[in-house]
Interface confidence: medium
């Protein structure tokens, strides 16, 4: 099975203010996946509906 | 992907500005949508975005007076501005990026001048 | 919000020349910095993001360095055709600041 997305590089270790920073490999570029309660591209804003 | 600024050019003091960034090629409800504009003397500002699912973010140093809206339908998102000032004499651009913070791709730039 | 300082403010140098163009935060931005170019009557362009990542379809004589509040723009053995002003965009810390740009002229 081969994996869509790699952990970050050391350049992106602060890209997701509040989550996990993720690589898509096909897309070449970073993805956040959000900790519970916070929404945006980077996890930056607190989502006021969770 | 293809994006285009329109506007009206040319605005009065306490006017509300309205601009249109219309796009072809490529779907506003993926990635996100801002705003950028370059004053006289080269500077650039930040000015907001609105993302795929319709949230925004907006510079805190426009917050009062700014607002980005969408209509999917037509494929274009909206800027509007108001109580503008002669400060608001620029060269605004709309532009994609497909994480807020990267912008590959931009319009051409509508210019506007507040004068009385 | 993060100041970007861009030096030198322009700087003139001759086809086949290498030049360096810097750009200082005032505080980290763990590589999260990107360098645009605006020719005369143009649109800006993404050159570098990242700090160092190269963007497709941008000619390899451009590099960028750096980490921290310090990054560099080199452009290898300039051409006529980078005449035009070089920014450098913080995407650490929103809001997102740009430079105040550094202006290239080709003698």
């Known amino acids: 099975v081969v994996s869509h997305f790699n952990d970050c590089p050391d350049s992106h270790t602060q890209f997701c203010f509040h989550g996990t920073c993720r690589f898509l490999v096909q897309e070449d570029k970073p993805a956040c996946v959000c900790a519970s309660g916070y929404v945006g591209a980077r996890c930056e804003h607190a989502d006021l509906l969770a | 992907v293809q994006l285009q600024e329109s506007g009206p050019g040319l605005a009065k003091p306490s006017q509300t500005l309205s601009l249109t960034c219309s796009v072809t090629g490529y779907s506003i409800t993926s990635d996100y949508w801002n705003w950028i504009r370059k004053f006289p003397g080269n500077k650039l500002e930040y000015m907001g975005y609105i993302s795929y699912s319709g949230s925004t973010y907006y510079n805190p140093s426009l917050k009062s007076r700014i607002s980005i809206t969408r209509d999917t339908s037509k494929n274009q998102y909206y800027l509007q501005l108001n109580s503008v000032t002669t400060e608001d004499t620029a060269t605004y651009y709309c532009a994609r990026s497909y994480d807020g913070i990267c912008f590959d791709n931009w319009g051409q730039g509508t210019t506007l001048t507040v004068s009385s | 919000d993060i100041l970007m300082t861009q030096s030198p403010a322009t700087l003139s140098v001759t086809p086949g020349e290498t030049v360096s163009l810097s750009c200082r935060a005032s505080?980290?931005?763990?590589?999260?910095l990107h360098w645009y170019q605006q020719k005369s009557h143009g649109t800006p362009k993404l050159l570098i993001k990242y700090a160092s990542a190269p963007i497709s379809g941008i000619p390899s004589r451009f590099t960028g360095s750096g980490s921290g509040t310090d990054y560099t723009l080199s452009i290898n053995s300039v051409k006529p055709e980078d005449e035009g002003i070089y920014y450098c965009l913080q995407g650490y810390s929103m809001p997102w600041t740009f430079g105040g740009g550094t202006k290239l002229e080709i003698k």
């Open positions: 505080q980290n931005t763990y590589k999260n």
